[in-house]
Interface confidence: medium
C-alpha cells in the first residue's frame, strides 16, 4: 500500500520582504526519500525542478532555490511540491514574496526573518546547506 505523502513546507531566506536587487532563497522541505522538489509560481504557471535534495534532519529533506537579484517580476506567490516515487505530493501553502524599493533608512528592516508556510512553521536551518556549488545562483529567468 502506498504511503500518504505529507505536504511540503516552504520558507524564504532571509525573509519574504526583499529589497530590489537583493537575493532570496526559497527552501522547500519534505520527508526523506524525495527525488525531486518543484518550486511553483502562481497556480503552476511557471515552475522549476531540482534533484539537488539534501537531508535537513533524520526525517526531512530539503531543496533550495536561489534568486540572485530579485526584481519586481519576482514578486508574487510561491509554493512547493515534491516527487517521491511513484507519485507527486500535494502542494504546500503559498508563500508571498514582496519586493520593495531600497529605502536606505535605518529604521526600516530589510526583511521579515523566518517566513514560512506549510505544516512546520519554523525558520529554516542553514547548517544543512551542503548542496553542490553548481546549484548556487538560480537566476531569475528560471522562475519566470
Amino acid at each position: 500500500q502506498e504511503e500518504d505523502l505529507p505536504r511540503p513546507s516552504i520558507s524564504a531566506e532571509p525573509g519574504t520582504v526583499i529589497p530590489l536587487g537583493s537575493h532570496v532563497t526559497f527552501v522547500c522541505r519534505g520527508p526523506v526519500g524525495v527525488q525531486t522538489f518543484r518550486l511553483e509560481r502562481e497556480s503552476r504557471s511557471t515552475y522549476n525542478d531540482t534533484e539537488d535534495v539534501s537531508q535537513a534532519s533524520p526525517s526531512e529533506s530539503e531543496a533550495r532555490f536561489r534568486i540572485d537579484s530579485v526584481s519586481e517580476g519576482n514578486a508574487g506567490p510561491y509554493r512547493c511540491i515534491y516527487y517521491k516515487p511513484p507519485k507527486w505530493s500535494e502542494q504546500s501553502d503559498y508563500l508571498e514574496l514582496l519586493v520593495k524599493e531600497t529605502s536606505g533608512g535605518p529604521d526600516s528592516p530589510d526583511t521579515e526573518p523566518g517566513s514560512s508556510a506549510g505544516p512546520t512553521q519554523r525558520p529554516s536551518d542553514n547548517s544543512h546547506n551542503e548542496h553542490a556549488p553548481a546549484s548556487q545562483g538560480l537566476k531569475a529567468e528560471h522562475l519566470y
Epitope: S45, Y47, D49, E51, A134, S135
Partner: antibody
Framework: SSSVEESGGRLVTPGTPLTLTCTVS????????MGWVRQAPGKGLEWIGT?????NTYYASWAKGRFTISKTSTTVDLKITSPITEDTATYFC????????????????WGPGTLVTISS | ELVMTQPPASVSAAVGGTVTINCQAS??????LAWYQQRPGQPPKLLIY???TLASGVPSRFKGSGSGTDYTLTITDLECADAATYYC????????????FGGGTEVEIK
C-alpha cells in the same frame, strides 16, 4: 575540450541483448545529465531516456522496460534488453546543458552516433 | 503523454529569403523548448534553448519565439548551409515523456 563518443553498435539478431557505451571526456558525469536519442534510417529523432547526476533515470513511455540507462564515473551505458527489428537506428549520446534544474535538460553536446542493426 | 507536432515535413525557400518552422506541444511547456539543426550524416546541433535563447556560436539569423503550446523558429537571410532538418524538443517534465522531439522539418534551399 569536451566530447562524447558512442560505441558498441553492431549487427545483432532479434532478442539478443545489446549494450551501447558513451564515453565522455573533458567534463565530469557528476556535473551533467546525459541522454540517449535514436534515429531510424530516414526518420526523425526519438528521445529514449535521460540519466541525472544523481543517477535517477527518466524514459520515454515507449522505451520503459525495453531500455536501461546506467553510468559509471566516465561512461553512460544504454542496454537494449530484447531488441526487435524496429530498434534498428543510429543511437546518439548527448550531454545536457546543466546538472540540477530540469530547465537545463536540453542537449548541448552530441556524439557522432553508433549504428545498431537488428536483423535475423 | 506529451506530444510535439511539427508541421510541415518539408519547406522550400530561396537563398536570402526567410523560412518559418512551427512546433506545437500537446500541453503548455512554459518555454522549455529547444531547436536543433541536423545536416545529413551529422549529429544534431543545438540552435536555441528556452524557446528564444541563442546557443553559443549560432548566428543571429536564427530566432526562436513562442510561449505556451505554440513555438516558432525563424531563419532569415537564408544560406545554402542552412539546408538541413530542424527539430524542436521539449524538456518540460521529466516524469511525463518530458524530452519529446517533434517530427522534424526539412528545409530545402532553392
Amino acid at each position: 575540450s569536451s566530447s562524447v563518443e558512442e560505441s558498441g553498435g553492431r549487427l545483432v539478431t532479434p532478442g539478443t541483448p545489446l549494450t551501447l557505451t558513451c564515453t565522455v571526456s573533458g567534463f565530469s558525469l557528476s556535473s551533467y545529465v546525459m541522454g540517449w536519442v535514436r534515429q531510424a534510417p530516414g526518420k526523425g529523432l526519438e528521445w529514449i531516456g535521460t540519466i541525472s547526476i544523481r543517477s535517477n533515470t527518466y524514459y520515454a513511455s515507449w522505451a520503459k522496460g525495453r531500455f536501461t540507462i546506467s553510468k559509471t564515473s566516465t561512461t553512460v551505458d544504454l542496454k537494449i534488453t530484447s531488441p526487435i527489428t524496429e530498434d534498428t537506428a543510429t543511437y546518439f549520446c548527448a550531454r545536457g546543458a546543466g546538472n540540477v534544474y530540469y530547465s537545463d535538460y536540453y542537449f548541448s553536446l552530441w556524439g557522432p552516433g553508433t549504428l545498431v542493426t537488428i536483423s535475423s | 503523454e506529451l506530444v510535439m507536432t511539427q508541421p510541415p515535413a518539408s519547406v522550400s525557400a530561396a537563398v536570402g529569403g526567410t523560412v518559418t518552422i512551427n512546433c506545437q506541444a500537446s500541453q503548455n511547456i512554459y518555454s522549455n523548448l529547444a531547436w536543433y539543426q541536423q545536416r545529413p550524416g551529422q549529429p544534431p546541433k543545438l540552435l536555441i534553448y528556452k524557446a528564444s535563447t541563442l546557443a553559443s556560436g549560432v548566428p543571429s539569423r536564427f530566432k526562436g519565439s513562442g510561449s505556451g503550446t505554440d513555438y516558432t523558429l525563424t531563419i532569415t537571410d537564408l544560406e545554402c548551409a542552412d539546408a538541413a532538418t530542424y527539430y524542436c524538443q521539449t524538456y518540460y517534465n521529466m516524469m511525463d515523456d518530458g524530452a519529446a522531439f517533434g517530427g522534424g522539418t526539412e528545409v530545402e534551399i532553392k
